[in-house]
């Protein structure tokens, strides 16, 4: 068998709410993957899991379940979407993400997902991680690959 | 608990200068942006000066733009405000509050900036 | 620059009895995100200010339940449902929506 590879190319889209009383954010974010199959015979995607980290802290998952399959030589694009919650026990982020003085409220989140593929029985995983940029402040469409923060150090939070 | 200590004002002569300090403590300072408010001798509050958690963000009222400057170390702690060119109405009581979108949530004890021949 | 306006005194009140404090904003302090940039602070004689109401209509912490607010856009009221003799001082509302960040020039409650 010939490699699967998946490529994570960066956040879609991040919709933001507030609760105001528990000064708790929720961030929607939309993130987007590339897979593409090398092989001479379909695979099915059987699941992504995804998990959003703030400050070393998961704020968000999401499990998609028999997503798709992709032909032979094939690239598949999926969107998928991770509910996420910064909540009162980070209630500083609430008021640096609703002060409105700051025009980008640009917060570093790690990205990890998990890609579970199937062909004839056999079962592969592939996993990546990312720091993006997502701004807490406003609802924001991105530019497949703009949110993407490049420093290779953990950035400190 | 939350504190924080201002010092550096004083009797000043007009167009002298005075630096004032905020002694941040009892919360992670680097995280929160702060502001300086004024009360005037008619007890009028004023918003001054606004600067961000990591100082990229710096805003000034119409009245002290060009003739204070708002400044932080996240090492030490420490909010600043250097006052140049004074003019007898910035005589005021001056505070130091920690900012948000929940608003000045914590306030100084103040310092008073007299400018008076 | 957003205009706050205060009267400059509450219409005296009985303790034990509730008191409203107005305040009207010169633009909509209502921002896109559903937000209402309105605040309350309380400045008792001799002492800093203190936020009561943060965001319109939420207590902030370690303030007494019997302290409320709401409004529109434009229009806020403050009330206290039962005075106390804690409660004498200046109360301003301030609009946090804009910069400048612009105060009210205060309303103080008067004790009957």
């Known amino acids: 068998p010939r490699s699967i590879d998946v490529k994570y190319i960066g956040v879609k889209s991040a919709y933001v709410s507030y609760d105001v009383q528990k000064r708790t954010i929720y961030l929607n974010i939309t993130n987007t993957l590339n897979i593409t199959n090398n092989n001479y015979y379909s695979v099915e995607v059987e699941n992504i899991t995804a998990q959003v980290q703030f400050a070393k802290t998961v704020i968000g998952k999401a499990r998609l379940n028999n997503i798709t399959h992709i032909g032979p030589l094939d690239m598949k694009q999926i969107d998928y979407t991770v509910p996420t919650v910064i909540a009162e026990e980070m209630s500083y982020m609430y008021d640096f993400c609703t002060l409105i003085s700051i025009k980008v409220h640009n917060i570093v989140l790690m990205m990890q997902v998990t890609v579970t593929t199937t062909y004839f029985g056999h079962s592969e995983q592939i996993s990546q991680e990312r720091y993006q940029y997502v701004d807490c402040g406003r609802n924001t469409t991105y530019q497949l690959g703009q949110s993407e923060y490049l420093n290779v150090l953990q950035p400190q939070q | 608990e939350v504190q924080l200590v201002e010092s550096g004002g004083g009797l000043v002569k007009p167009g002298g200068s005075l630096k004032l300090s905020c002694a941040a403590s009892g919360f992670t300072f680097s995280n929160y942006a702060m502001s300086w408010v004024r009360e005037t001798p008619e007890k009028r509050l004023e918003w001054v000066a606004f600067i961000s958690d990591g100082g990229g963000y710096i805003y000034y009222a119409d009245n002290v733009k060009d003739r204070f400057t708002i400044s932080r170390d996240n090492a030490k702690n420490n909010l600043y405000l250097q006052m140049r060119h004074l003019k007898s109405e910035d005589t005021a009581m001056y505070y130091c509050?920690?900012?948000?979108?929940?608003?000045?949530?914590?306030w100084g004890q103040g310092t008073l900036v007299t400018v008076s021949v | 620059d957003i205009v706050m306006t205060q009267a400059a005194f509450s219409n005296p009140v009985t303790l034990g009895t509730s008191a409203s404090i107005s305040c009207r904003s010169s633009k909509s302090l209502l921002h896109s995100n559903g937000i209402t940039y309105l605040f309350w602070y309380l400045q008792k004689p001799g002492q800093s200010p203190q936020l009561l109401i943060y965001?319109?209509?939420n207590l902030a912490s370690g303030v007494p339940d019997r302290f409320s607010s709401s409004g529109s856009g434009t229009d806020f009221t403050l009330r206290i449902s039962r005075v106390e003799a804690e409660d004498v001082g200046v109360y301003y509302c301030v609009q946090n929506l804009e910069l400048p960040y612009t105060f009210g020039g205060g309303t103080k409650l008067e004790i009957k």
């Open positions: 965001q319109m209509s």
């Open positions: 509050a920690r900012d948000g979108g929940t608003g000045f949530t914590y």
